[in-house]
């Protein structure tokens, strides 16, 4: 398919040839092409390309271009050749190649397909059935990421209310670039009756830490010392804690944001691996104080900033006064 720009051209190169498109993994779309036939001998060929909506313009010498994209809608690439990296130079006539999503009734595709990476150890995806789907549909979720050699099928399909879901192991590897990548997801049915749905989950988003575990509460003068175990797998710069203290007598509800803190006071059990400590000032020891803690990722480590962990189990200290 040729796309001619309406502006007049001078000395433009011939169009590229054999533009083709293919899909690797689940959501890696790759276009390849051959150099134009009869290009000027004094021309150092560069290729201008952009997607159908004129997004992501690129000028590069390679005869391929790839994009990671959920194949839920048609995507087109237009490619032209030119003799320099100058964006103002007119490229050749643009050649376009499109790829369409798998066939099927759009109303049959699952909706609200989303995934959460729990404690950097497993990923849990959930979805709602499409409108045109039979209630006994058996779903299959496939996933792929860079550290896998091939596409894997998720085995642990479950149902929670209206939602279906599946979870699979996904452990952060030491390779520092691991989290710069994404997990590609596809949900379809075993019988091939529904239109497949795709999603791409960046590993820098949708991270939910495990809740902390409170180990110890103790009073020293009018200060309450709280000691807890941090969730595993995270580095200290990537988490912060919300400590909530409720007092039964005053019915006050105090919330403190806490950086991961060393246990340096004598009141704390020292040098315990992976524990944090915090001193809550001005707490009445002769009243009942209930503490719970939750944790959240830092936006500088993980982009999605809406997910707190669940609350820890509550722990109380002090005594409830008798009401007279």
């Amino acid at each position: 398919d040729y796309k001619d720009d309406d502006e007049s051209r001078t000395e433009t190169q011939p169009p590229v040839t054999n533009l083709s498109v293919s899909v690797e993994n689940l959501c890696t779309v790759i276009w390849t092409w051959n150099p134009p036939e009869g290009a000027s001998s004094n021309c150092s060929l560069w290729y201008f390309s952009h997607f159908g909506d004129k997004q992501d313009k690129k000028i590069a010498p390679e005869t391929r271009r790839s994009i990671e994209v959920p194949l839920n809608e048609r995507i087109c690439l237009q490619v032209g050749s030119q003799c320099s990296t100058n964006e103002s130079e007119k490229p050749s006539i643009l050649v376009e190649k499109c790829i369409s999503p798998p066939e099927g009734d759009p109303e049959s595709a699952v909706t609200e397909l989303q995934c959460i990476w729990h404690n950097l150890s497993y990923m849990k995806c959930s979805w709602l059935p499409g409108r045109n789907t039979s209630p006994d549909t058996n779903y299959t979720l496939y996933y792929w990421h860079r550290s896998l050699e091939k596409i894997h099928q998720c085995e642990n399909i479950f149902r929670e209310g209206q939602y279906f879901g599946c979870s699979f192991d996904l452990t952060k590897v030491k390779d520092s670039s691991f989290e710069q990548h994404s997990v590609q997801i596809m949900v379809k049915d075993n019988a091939g009756k529904i239109k497949p749905s795709f999603n791409i989950v960046p590993l820098t988003s949708r991270v939910k830490p495990d809740p902390p575990h409170i180990k110890n509460l103790s009073f020293h003068n009018d200060d309450l010392y709280v000691q807890w175990e941090n969730p595993q797998n995270f580095i200290s710069r990537c988490l912060f804690y919300e400590v909530e203290v409720n007092n039964s007598q005053t019915e006050t509800h105090n919330v403190f944001y806490v950086q991961e803190a060393k246990c340096e006071n004598p009141e704390f059990e020292r040098n315990v691996e992976n524990t944090s400590c915090f001193m809550v000032p001005g707490v009445l020891p002769d009243t009942l104080n209930t503490v719970r803690i939750r944790v959240k990722t830092n936006k500088l480590c993980y982009e999605d900033d809406k997910l707190w962990s669940n609350w820890s189990q509550e722990m109380s200290i002090g005594k409830k006064r008798n009401s007279t």
Partner: antibody, heavy 118, light 104 residues
Amino acid sequence: EVQLVQSGAEVKKPGESLKISCKGSGYSFTSYWIGWVRQMPGKGLEWMGVIYPGDSYTRYSPSFQGQVTISADKSISTAYLQWSSLKASDTAMYYCVRMPNWGSLDHWGQGTLVTVSS
Amino acid sequence: EIVLTQSPGTLSLSPGERATLSCRASQSISSSYLAWYQQKPGQAPRLLIYGASSRATGIPDRFSGSGSGTDFTLTISRLEPEDFAVYYCQQYASFGQGTKVEIK
């Protein structure tokens, strides 16, 4: 008491290099981020970037990426902001800040005024 | 990139009056990360509010913060003479352009 003490005012010519410093005290220097904020004359605040001295992990605002370098020496609890080639438009007050993981800037240095003029 | 827009640009009030400053985010943000600062001429800014509503250490209780999603508010219940200054909201790498609170 948490303190961030910055190096003194600088007057430079365009094209020159510069490295300003910020020394932290009164807290665990390796457990908090240190950031830099620019304020041009009569203007608002601009977030330049941060470093986590514990492992020297840095993040830059897109506007400052490649324009400046943020570094830290945890052995002397000091963070640095440097330019390899100053421009007149770099004339501003530069503040170093301490940042906990929830992103607020809870302690500020006194500021370093950088003037770049031929 | 998230853009924070503060309004009004300038607020002219008398001591003892209530000041309401607005900060609107271009997309929904977590209130955990929203902070407010005060800056007086010739001084470094100082943190007033973090986590949208928690007062920083030593900040008088006439300062309060509220809001969630895209709309956040800083309220000064009764303006004292020392409160006339410029106020900024911030979320990580983004600052609002500032609201100047001046004496009427």
